[in-house]
């Protein structure tokens, strides 16, 4: 039985050219996290954080994605094309997979607010 819950940064907005932290947090489970996958809206993998092997950033994102903090991901040099859904997938033993969703809106406006509050999707 899967007892855990994924909390995410929810819906966030950030300035074009700026950076943003994508964060998921798994709680309420004894399960052991063995891998975390980060995917973009088109299901392309951005990065993988493997318990044994550490971080792997996919080549297409190497220049703009930094691992962390923690199991999160930092997107840098944001463009308008970065607007969309992002997913964290936690592979856990013995529970299975937990998936969290974050929606990022990249704004042209120089006064774009960067809101990042934790919420359960």
């Amino acid at each position: 039985m899967m007892t855990g819950t994924i909390e995410t940064t929810g819906n966030i907005s950030a300035k074009k050219g700026g950076s943003v932290i994508l964060q998921c947090h798994l709680s309420s489970t004894m399960a052991q996290v063995t891998q975390v996958n980060w995917e973009q809206h088109d299901h392309s993998l951005l990065a993988i954080r493997n318990a044994e092997l550490g971080w792997h950033i996919y080549p297409a994102f190497k220049d703009r994605v930094a691992p962390g903090p923690g199991l999160g991901l930092t997107l840098q040099s944001l463009t308008m094309n970065d607007t969309g859904e992002y997913f964290c997938t936690y592979h856990t033993y013995p529970d299975g997979t937990y998936r969290g969703r974050i929606f990022l809106e990249v704004l042209e406006s120089s006064v774009a607010e960067h809101s990042a509050r934790f919420q359960i999707p």
Partner: antibody, heavy 122, light 107 residues
Framework: EVQLVQSGSDLKKPGASVRVSCKAS????????MNWVRQAPGHGLEWMGW????????TYVQGFTGRFVFSLDTSVNTAYLQISSLKAEDTAVYFC???????????????WGQGTMVTVSS | DIQLTQSPTFLSASVGDRVTITCRAS??????LAWYQQNPGKAPKLLIY???TLQSGVPSRFSGSGSGTEFTLTISSLQPEDFVTYYC?????????FGQGTKVEIK
């Protein structure tokens, strides 16, 4: 070489306690969950539960609560199984086994200890 | 809890035979199934994981198939060292369970 080496066979009297050790080498101990499996003489494999090697939190299967304790010493890459108030029916081979695979669809017990025979007899 | 039923419990065969062992789950477990081989007095050895992926170093005469609730382990040509016991195990959440085992004996 990735391996799990368990402590030797033990003969105990009913009511006594026993501790079985399982020393890991060749990999990052805290990256893989550790399981305990019992096999009574002439019987099949029985999953007793597992321990989260990151947090030290144990999870016990029904039937293995109370007298059974899983623990870790990460400084020496070792998992332990302690059984107290031993009964004749605890006579069995006890195996530790690592959960290999990193994604949910690839989990399996890929590395096993050689087994520790615990005999409970008066 | 998800129960696994292996069949047959005992299997008599000859060297060179093709044999199939079946494992049925009491509910859908996707492909979260492993197969192990156990020699008497030894620890089990992983043969197949994710229902059909051969573990590194395992001879290619072993193969696995199936998904959902019905799974099979096939040995294409039995060798003398294959006359031992085989177990399936599901890893679909908690608790993980093993099948009761299939002992392959020489006919």
């Amino acid at each position: 070489e990735v391996q799990l080496v368990q402590s030797g066979s033990d003969l105990k009297k009913p009511g006594a306690s026993v501790r079985v050790s399982c020393k890991a080498s060749g990999y990052t101990f805290t990256s893989y969950p550790m399981n305990w499996v019992r096999q009574a003489p002439g019987h099949g494999l029985e999953w007793m539960g597992w321990i989260n090697t990151n947090t030290g939190n144990p999870t016990y299967v029904q039937g293995f609560t109370g007298r059974f304790v899983f623990s870790l010493d990460t400084s020496v890459n070792t998992a332990y199984l302690q059984i107290s108030s031993l009964k004749a029916e605890d006579t069995a081979v006890y195996f530790c086994a690592r959960t290999g695979g990193h994604t949910y669809d690839s989990y399996a017990f890929d590395v096993w200890g050689q087994g520790t025979m615990v005999t409970v007899s008066s | 809890d998800i129960q696994l039923t292996q069949s047959p419990t005992f299997l008599s065969a000859s060297v060179g035979d093709r044999v199939t062992i079946t494992c049925r789950a009491s509910q859908v477990i996707s492909s979260s199934l492993a197969w192990y081989q156990q020699n008497p007095g030894k620890a089990p050895k992983l043969l197949i994981y994710a229902a059909s992926t051969l573990q590194s170093g395992v001879p290619s005469r072993f193969s696995g198939s199936g998904s959902g609730t019905e799974f099979t382990l096939t040995i294409s040509s039995l060798q003398p060292e294959d006359f031992v016991t085989y177990y399936c195990q599901h890893l679909h959440g908690y608790p993980s369970n093993f099948g009761q085992g299939t002992k392959v004996e020489i006919k």
